[in-house]
């Protein structure tokens, strides 16, 4: 004969555990029903009556089968630098992520605790690694033959144009200026031409540092919580 199906609450066999979606109540010493996601235990079970469940109140939730006496509070409303990517419901917590142009500087178990704006690279520097949801932009000095004349969190170093006759040679923060009317664009080996986003504003080229305040040339600030990479800097 098939074993009789036990209905909760029931006393488990010695050495056995309660079934899926059940829990062992120490006081009643019985296997009792868990409450479904979106509910909590309003009344715990006894030897003769099963768990009584009730729906979570507004702004509270339970995500798992449970026997908690109170639902968990949803996190506070998303701050102005965040967007709500998951709403607070009876079955799930609110999740806030950083808005475009920002990244998560201090994370928490779900979502982000503190967002920060993506830093921008100055003229003479291009984006080495773009910012992500969880990491800041990394800048790199423009190599000889390339330049960036913008303050941007997306612009890479671009090749100088090649002139038939050079009026003003290019540098790290300025393109070459040609005297001829039809310059040809340089395509250095490996150079990639991406569509360049419009800069936020016209930018003065960075002045040459005065020796008394010029930084040393061995430090590239890191992105996120990773160690710094090596690279040269200008002031």
């Amino acid at each position: 004969l098939p074993a009789q199906v036990a209905f909760t609450p029931y006393a488990p066999e010695p050495g056995s555990t309660c079934r899926l979606r059940e829990y062992y109540d120490q006081t009643a010493q019985m296997c009792c029903s868990k409450c479904s996601p979106g509910q909590h235990a309003k009344v715990f079970c006894t030897k003769t009556s099963d768990t009584v469940c009730d729906s979570c109140e507004d702004s509270t939730y339970t995500q798992l089968w449970n026997w908690v006496p109170e639902c968990l509070s949803c996190g506070s409303r998303c701050s102005s630098d965040q967007v709500e990517t998951q709403a607070c419901t009876r079955e799930q917590n609110r999740i806030c992520t950083c808005r475009p142009g920002w990244y998560c500087a201090l994370s928490k178990q779900e979502g982000c605790r503190l967002c920060a704006p993506l830093r921008k690279c100055r003229p003479g520097f291009g984006v080495a690694r773009p910012g992500t949801e969880t990491s800041d932009v990394v800048c790199k000095p423009c190599a000889p033959g390339t330049f960036s004349n913008t303050t941007s969190s997306t612009d890479i170093c671009r090749p100088h144009q090649i002139c038939n006759v050079v009026a003003i040679p290019g540098n790290a923060s300025m393109d070459a200026v040609c005297t001829s009317t039809s310059p040809t664009r340089s395509m250095a080996p490996g150079a990639v031409h991406l569509p360049q986003p419009v800069s936020t504003r016209s930018q003065h080229t960075q002045p040459t540092p005065e020796p008394s305040t010029a930084p040393s040339t061995s430090f590239l600030l890191p992105m996120g919580p990773s160690p710094p990479a090596e690279g040269s800097t200008g002031d």
Epitope: A116, C139, E210, P227, T233, D235
Partner: antibody, heavy 123, light 110 residues
């Protein structure tokens, strides 16, 4: 010579306003992120805020709503407008230039400082 | 909100001593840390940025180390000119911040 010179400090009554100026010579202020740091008598350094080279402003929590950082590129001058002043705002206020390390438009790390101007808030 | 805590607040030492000052951040700031020196009545002077990179013109007896939440400033052989107050500063984040500087460490003559 590259230097920053603050002015505009003095005695002001609680609830009053004051505007500090920082005049730069030898550098083009518009190319740099510039900030303010203050120091109460006998106390440590306290970050006030800065304006990035791209024009974005960042403030300490306590300064938001009362203090405003701006600049006039044509005058090569940085400003700190302080409103609703309190006794605890009494301090030497320093203007400082961001080092721009790592090629960033701001790092909040200052490698050039002015001599400071004293603001006293008292009745 | 990231807070910076320096220790000790005061340090008595003699010329020639090796001096160590520590700075602790409440959250990981990677290597976004600077050290400044300040003498009475003067503006602060940047010594180290990026936790360990010496600013131009700063004597090599100064060195910095650490990453994440624990940082150290070391003066290998204290000179008469080094008696001053030293501050650490985080440069990692500027949103929701009360102060970016540590409380300071005064290095005085023993």
């Amino acid at each position: 010579e590259v230097q920053l010179v603050e002015s505009g400090g003095g005695l002001v009554q609680p609830g009053g306003s004051l505007r500090l100026s920082c005049a730069a010579s030898g550098i083009d202020l518009s190319s740099y992120t510039m900030g303010w740091v203050r120091q109460a008598p006998g106390k440590g350094l306290e970050w006030v805020g800065f304006i990035s080279s791209s024009g974005h402003t960042y403030y300490a929590n306590w300064a938001k709503g009362r203090f405003t950082i701006s600049r006039d590129n044509s005058k090569n001058t940085l400003y700190l407008q302080m409103n609703s002043l309190r006794a605890e705002d009494t301090a030497v206020y320093y203007c400082a230039r961001d080092g721009g390390y790592g090629g960033y438009d701001y790092t909040g790390i200052f490698n050039l400082w002015g001599q400071g101007t004293l603001v006293t808030v008292s009745s | 909100d990231i807070q910076m805590t320096q220790s000790p607040s005061t340090l008595s030492a003699s010329v020639g001593d090796r001096v160590t000052i520590t700075c602790q951040a409440t959250e990981s700031i990677s290597s976004w840390l600077a050290w400044y020196q300040q003498k009475p009545g003067k503006a602060p002077k940047l010594l180290i940025y990026g936790a360990s990179t010496l600013e131009s013109g700063v004597p090599s007896r100064f060195s910095g180390s650490g990453s994440g939440t624990e940082f150290t400033l070391t003066i290998s052989s204290l000179q008469p000119d080094d008696f001053a107050t030293y501050y650490c500063q985080q440069g990692y984040i500027y949103t929701n911040v009360d102060n970016t500087f540590g409380g300071g460490t005064k290095v005085e003559i023993k």
